[in-house]
């Protein structure tokens, strides 16, 4: 039997054992987070699957993910939201130690999809493990990109109090308007709920004594935020090594003091 013709995309295919991984992550998450114990993981998987299975993978919409978003509804306490841009690992290491702060990937939906790729095929119930659309080379309305846009928008919309964002001071564009933070989250913070955005600019090392809060891209971020009637603050963080030290040894009393 000849294999059926399959669309060839430029991006890597669906992560192997994708359904099993999502289901297992859901079960693990709901076991660890008592406030999410009511969640039925089979329903979550069905809603996730329903967002992209048998749909043309370049024509996915935020609407497709609404059933999943509804099932994964979760709130973060005020002042405890941590956004990040181009510095994911450090942000996650931070919230692993500072347990009362949360990135999107610390929430159920972000946790389910973190580092995974997925797509289906039009008019079949199959998952495409060979290739999936690349955001640049194929299309932006692909299952993965639309998922992150959807959940990032929701995460930003529900944030309240003082919101923090961790930015990578080693990059040429410390604030990038084209990042998920710059294109989605910044514009969906709600001025009536969010008093301020505080940026933490993480320096490459102790030797870099510059004031990166003066960087033109940070000034651009400040302008965008201020125009939305949200106050903006920025801090230089010179000690990424302190993060790593605390991740290795979170009981160390030098890691337990306030931010």
């Amino acid at each position: 039997v000849l294999p059926r013709w399959r669309q060839q995309w430029s991006g890597s295919g669906t992560t192997s054992r994708f359904p099993e991984t999502v289901l297992a992550r859901c079960v693990k998450y709901t076991e660890v987070h008592p406030e999410m114990r009511h969640v039925d993981c089979q329903s979550v998987w069905d809603a996730f699957k329903g967002a992209f299975i048998s749909k043309y993978p370049c024509n996915i919409t935020e609407e497709d993910y609404q059933p999943l978003v509804k099932l994964g509804t979760q709130t973060v306490p005020c002042n405890k939201t941590l956004l990040w841009s181009r510095i994911k690992d450090l942000a996650h290491q931070f919230t692993q130690v500072q347990r009362d702060m949360f990135t999107l990937e610390d929430m159920l939906l972000g946790y389910l999809a973190d580092d995974l790729t997925w797509c289906g095929e039009f008019n079949t119930f199959e998952i495409n493990y060979q290739s999936c659309p690349d955001w640049r080379k194929d299309c932006s309305n692909n299952p993965v990109s639309v998922f992150w846009k959807t959940v990032s928008r929701r995460f930003a919309e529900t944030a309240c109090g003082v919101v923090h964002v961790m930015l990578n001071g080693s990059r040429s564009k410390i604030f990038d308007k084209n990042s998920t933070f710059g294109s989605v989250e910044v514009h969906n913070l709600q001025p009536e709920k969010v008093q301020a955005l505080e940026a933490w600019v993480i320096h490459g090392g102790r030797e870099d004594s510059r004031d990166l809060c003066q960087d033109p891209t940070i000034k651009e971020l400040e302008s965008i935020i201020s125009k939305r009637n949200i106050r903006f603050f920025c801090k230089n963080i010179y000690r990424p090594d302190k993060f790593l030290q605390c991740v290795k040894n979170p009981e160390d009393s030098s890691c337990l003091s306030g931010i």
Epitope: F94, V97, Q98, W200, H203, R206, E207, D208, S209, D211, C213, Q214, F233, C234, K235, N236, I237, Y238, R239, K242, F243, Q245, C246, N249, D252, S253, S254, C255, S257, G258, I259
Partner: antibody
């Protein structure tokens, strides 16, 4: 409780050398970066030098670079400051201080009582 | 390096509020700590990370930091608060302000 006790201060002639020690107790010494901070008579505080928890990285104020060497012996819970080519302007009380901090910043939560170094002919 | 400037002295009546400033170019972009030092004694940390109080430090001590000025506020100042106060920041190296002598009148 945390205790830092400095020793080794005294009177020394310009160009001379001195080695300060700081004996630490009441905490896991090898988990903390340590620093020396000095205070000239009637003046303010000046950071002198710092060393990472395992001694792999050392840092110096420009005013002492090339003349002072910071080191530590974690097996003895002791911090050292080797001071060479001493000048009159190095006259000060030298404090040993533990570097504490959150992920975001650093400060000195614990200080010794200090040891006086006088450089004079 | 950032330079931190403090007034040499501040006077306050007992029970009143004392404010000690620490100015520096865009100091709000850096975290600031404050130390109290009494004559013949080692410094004591009273505020860290702009506004956090270590355990054992009375609630009357508070801190703020924005723009070009960080401020240590002592509300209901007591005679025992008379001391020198130093601000400190970090930008890859530790920097201290010149110190402020707080005098409690009376």
């Amino acid at each position: 409780q945390v205790q830092l006790v400095e020793s080794g201060g005294g009177l020394v002639q310009p160009g001379g050398s001195l080695r300060l020690s700081c004996a630490a107790s009441g905490f896991t010494f090898s988990s903390y970066a340590m620093n020396w901070v000095r205070q000239a008579p009637g003046k303010g505080l000046e950071w002198v030098s710092g060393i990472s928890s395992w001694g792999s990285s050392t840092y110096y104020a420009d005013s002492v670079k090339g003349r002072f060497t910071i080191s530590r012996d974690n097996s003895k819970n002791t911090l050292y400051l080797q001071m060479n080519s001493l000048r009159a302007e190095d006259t000060a009380v030298y404090y040993c201080a533990r570097e504490d901090g959150s992920y975001m910043t650093d400060y000195f939560a614990y200080w010794g009582q200090g040891t006086l170094v006088t450089v004079s002919s | 390096d950032i330079e931190l400037t403090q007034p040499p002295s501040v006077s306050v009546a007992p029970g009143q509020t004392a404010r000690i400033s620490c100015s520096g170019d865009n100091i709000g972009h850096y975290y600031v700590s404050w130390y109290q030092q009494k004559p013949g004694q080692a410094p004591v940390l009273v505020i860290y990370s702009d506004s956090n109080r270590p355990s054992g430090i009375p609630e009357r001590f508070s801190g703020s930091n924005s723009g070009n000025t960080a401020t240590l506020t002592i509300s209901g100042t007591q005679a025992e608060d008379e001391a020198d106060y130093y601000c400190q920041s970090y930008n890859g190296t530790y920097v201290f302000g010149g110190g402020t002598k707080l005098t409690v009148l009376g």
